[in-house]
Interface confidence: low
């Protein structure tokens, strides 16, 4: 396994609708054909997998149908969007990139993007 540099923004604020987007960029040391991207969430020293997708370079990322993630790729950049976030989902979201094919296998893990999610204030009752 060879190491690879992965860059991602330090902080992202989710929208009022609970959507957060960030770019995960990797320094490919060769001509990868197949890439796997995994988003991990670290909170309270626990790391859990949020979503993962394997894609051919130049193709759309295909996450599972019930995934909260969507994404697109452009060269060595992956644009990731996580939906359905609530305040309790605030945490460090780490981008993990693996160059799956052809060999050699490369692995890169970003430093993480701190995503802050603020639940919207409920609308006050109105007679109108």
């Amino acid at each position: 396994c060879k190491a690879m540099h992965v860059a991602q923004p330090a902080v992202v604020l989710a929208s009022s609708r609970g959507i957060a987007s960030f770019v995960c960029e990797y320094a490919s040391p060769g001509k990868a054909t197949e890439v796997r991207v995994t988003v991990l969430r670290q909170a309270d020293s626990q790391v859990t997998e949020v979503c993962a997708a394997t894609y051919m370079m130049g193709n759309e990322l295909t996450f599972l149908d019930d995934s909260i993630c969507t994404g697109t790729s452009s060269g060595n950049q992956v644009n990731l969007t996580i939906q359905g976030l609530r305040a309790m989902d605030t945490g460090l979201y780490i981008c993990k990139v693996e160059l799956m094919y052809p060999p050699p296998y490369y692995l890169g893990i970003g430093n993480g993007t701190q995503i802050y999610v603020i639940d919207p204030e409920p609308c006050p009752d109105s007679d109108f």
């Epitope: 060769g30 001509k31 197949e34 370079m57 052809p102």
Partner: antibody, heavy 124, light 113 residues
Framework: EVQLVESGGGLVQPGGSLRLSCAAS????????IHWVRQAPGKGLEWIGI????????NYAQKFQGRVTISRDNSKNTLYLQLNSLRAEDTAVYYC?????????????????WGQGTLVTVSS | DIQLTQSPSSLSASVGDRVTITCRAS??????????LAWYQQKPGKAPKLLIY???NRATGIPSRFSGSGSGTDFTLTISSLQPEDFATYYC???????????FGQGTKVEIK
């Protein structure tokens, strides 16, 4: 012996479909990406598409997009090519070919093992 | 997409001759110091056979009379001393990623003079 053997060729009506198979032996099939390449009579080589080793991700040449499907069954060491809406210009010998990879120092590439090819004739 | 142009499209040569085939790419095929260009030999009625990969590396079992050179956009396949079994058609091929595309040159037919 490392080999690929194509089958399923023959005469197909215009507008019809073909499904070709490529049986692999002598190597660990699930470790390699495999390609389909075709060659019209008296013409050059034309790349159709690639399927990756384990996930089965695919990519196709622009001219075949929407008309071709490549799939694989690693448990059967077999690769498949489905080509739809056939026309006369799809008449060709269809080859499957293994993607070379070697060592840990770089992304060496090339098609190092080829099948013998299977002839598909599209005619009414 | 990158286009590959081979020259000549055909040539006549004798056994023992030194033969050179060129392949020109419409833009550089180099990436991280590697030229992603391969050469194949094809005989009538047979599947292509890999000769050279990464512009200059001989594939397993290929005789030393075959050599590849070049970088960037200009590449050469040389057969130092043509043998009877070398009369065939030769193709260059380039690989690019994002998305993966594999492009072949139009071929060069080497015939007996």
């Amino acid at each position: 012996e490392v080999q690929l053997v194509e089958s399923g060729g023959g005469l197909v009506q215009p507008g019809g479909s073909l499904r070709l198979s490529c049986a692999a032996s002598g190597f660990t099939f699930s470790d390699y990406a495999i390609h389909w390449v075709r060659q019209a009579p008296g013409k050059g080589l034309e790349w159709i598409g690639i399927i990756s080793p384990s996930s089965g991700s695919t990519n196709y040449a622009q001219k075949f997009q929407g008309r071709v499907t490549i799939s694989r069954d690693n448990s059967k060491n077999t690769l498949y090519l489905q080509l739809n809406s056939l026309r006369a210009e799809d008449t060709a010998v269809y080859y499957c070919a293994r993607d070379i990879h070697s060592g840990s120092s770089g992304y060496y590439y090339g098609f190092d093992v080829w099948g013998q090819g299977t002839l598909v004739t599209v005619s009414s | 997409d990158i286009q590959l142009t081979q020259s000549p499209s055909s040539l006549s040569a004798s056994v023992g001759d030194r033969v050179t085939i060129t392949c020109r790419a419409s833009e550089s095929v180099d990436f991280f110091g590697i030229s992603f260009l391969a050469w194949y030999q094809q005989k009538p009625g047979k599947a292509p056979k890999l000769l050279i990969y990464d512009a200059s590396n001989r594939a397993t079992g290929i005789p030393s009379r075959f050599s590849g050179s070049g970088s960037g956009t200009d590449f050469t396949l040389t057969i130092s001393s043509l043998q009877p079994e070398d009369f065939a058609t030769y193709y260059c091929q380039h690989y690019t990623s994002s998305p993966p595309v594999y492009t072949f040159g139009q071929g060069t037919k080497v015939e007996i003079k």
